[in-house]
Interface confidence: low
């Protein structure tokens, strides 16, 4: 179980690197973040570490109320702060693993 979670964490972070470059990856991450109401791997600040993402920007799927461009110069109060690895991991533990 821990190995699966570790793999998921690594994979999620790897996909984050590809987010601005790959449409398929973007759609998967957008869907995960929107559906699980989470942002980034550990938390939303992970997006700051992606070199090809603009500064002060998270994907719009991080927003509590998703609108086009809501992730640009975001307000911390308007985005999901919980990380996806923990949130989706909890769901996986409960429902799958």
């Amino acid at each position: 179980r821990d190995k699966v979670m570790s793999e998921f964490n690594n994979n999620f972070r790897q996909q984050m690197e590809n987010y601005p470059k790959n449409n398929h990856t973007a759609s998967i991450l957008d869907r995960m973040q929107a559906d699980f109401k989470c942002c980034g791997a550990a938390n939303y600040t992970d997006w700051e570490k992606i070199p090809s993402m603009s500064k002060n920007r998270v994907p719009d799927s991080c927003c509590i109320n998703v609108t086009v461009g809501c992730g640009i110069n975001f307000n911390e109060k308007a985005i999901h702060k919980e990380g996806c690895v923990e949130k989706i991991g909890g769901w996986l533990r409960k429902n799958v693993l």
């Epitope: 601005p20 957008d30 994907p59």
Partner: antibody, heavy 119, light 108 residues
């Protein structure tokens, strides 16, 4: 205001080629994916292709794969559709459509340009 | 590919009526369902996105609901300008982006 304006439609013979263009204004063009969607006379909407905001990812419907090519020029705020080996069934109104990529609907449509393929 | 099926294909109604159009996906699409309105000779216009969110500028008499495979578009009180063709579209699994076949709403 936010606007998409298509051009380049017209009458062409089967097997011929046509290049459609779409000029965007009123928004940061390079932030958006762009689609071409068509509508044959009296029929419903058919998605045919899209291109991602950077221009390096393109997808096509099976009905046009290998014949149509989508491209964009972010410096000129424009997207193009090169249509080759045209068939009668390609006759339709072609719409240029903005896609926020967030999978929440295509929010801005051009007025459409008519393509007629007939001998 | 995900198929989208709308019903009915056409319907007649009067001004003031409450109208419901349904859309069914061939597999679960969560809430990734959008509704468009198209008037003759005009481009489609986005009404509802993410199954139930009203697009900016769209009157509140339009509403959407559903998730999974079954969705509805409701017009609470039909106005003369609402007579048009309505399309649903899934954005869950793309490409391809797929639309329903359309529902034509006519004046009774």
């Amino acid at each position: 205001q936010v606007q998409l304006v298509e051009s380049g439609g017209g009458l062409v013979k089967p097997g011929g080629s046509l290049r459609l263009s779409c000029a965007a204004s009123g928004f940061t063009f390079s932030d958006y994916y762009m689609n071409w969607i068509r509508q044959a006379p009296g029929k419903g909407l058919e998605w045919i292709t899209y291109i991602n905001n950077g221009g390096y990812t393109k997808y096509y419907a099976d009905s046009v794969k290998g014949r149509f090519i989508i491209s964009r020029d972010n410096t000129k705020n424009s997207v193009h559709l090169q249509m080759n080996s045209l068939r009668a069934e390609d006759t339709a109104v072609y719409y240029c459509v903005r896609d926020p990529r967030m999978y929440y609907g295509m929010d801005v449509w051009g007025q459409g340009t008519t393509v007629t393929v007939s001998s | 590919d995900i198929q989208m099926t709308q019903s009915p294909s056409s319907l007649s109604a009067s001004v003031g009526d409450r109208v419901t159009i349904t859309c069914r996906a061939s597999q679960s699409i969560s809430s990734y369902l959008n509704w468009y309105q198209q008037k003759p000779g005009k481009a489609p216009k986005l009404l509802i996105y993410a199954a139930s969110s009203l697009q900016s500028g769209v009157p509140s008499r339009f509403s959407g609901s559903g998730s999974g495979t079954d969705f509805t578009l409701t017009i609470s009180s039909l106005q003369p300008e609402d007579f048009a063709t309505y399309y649903c579209q899934q954005s869950y699994s793309t490409p391809p982006i797929t639309f329903g076949q359309g529902t034509r709403l006519e004046i009774k």
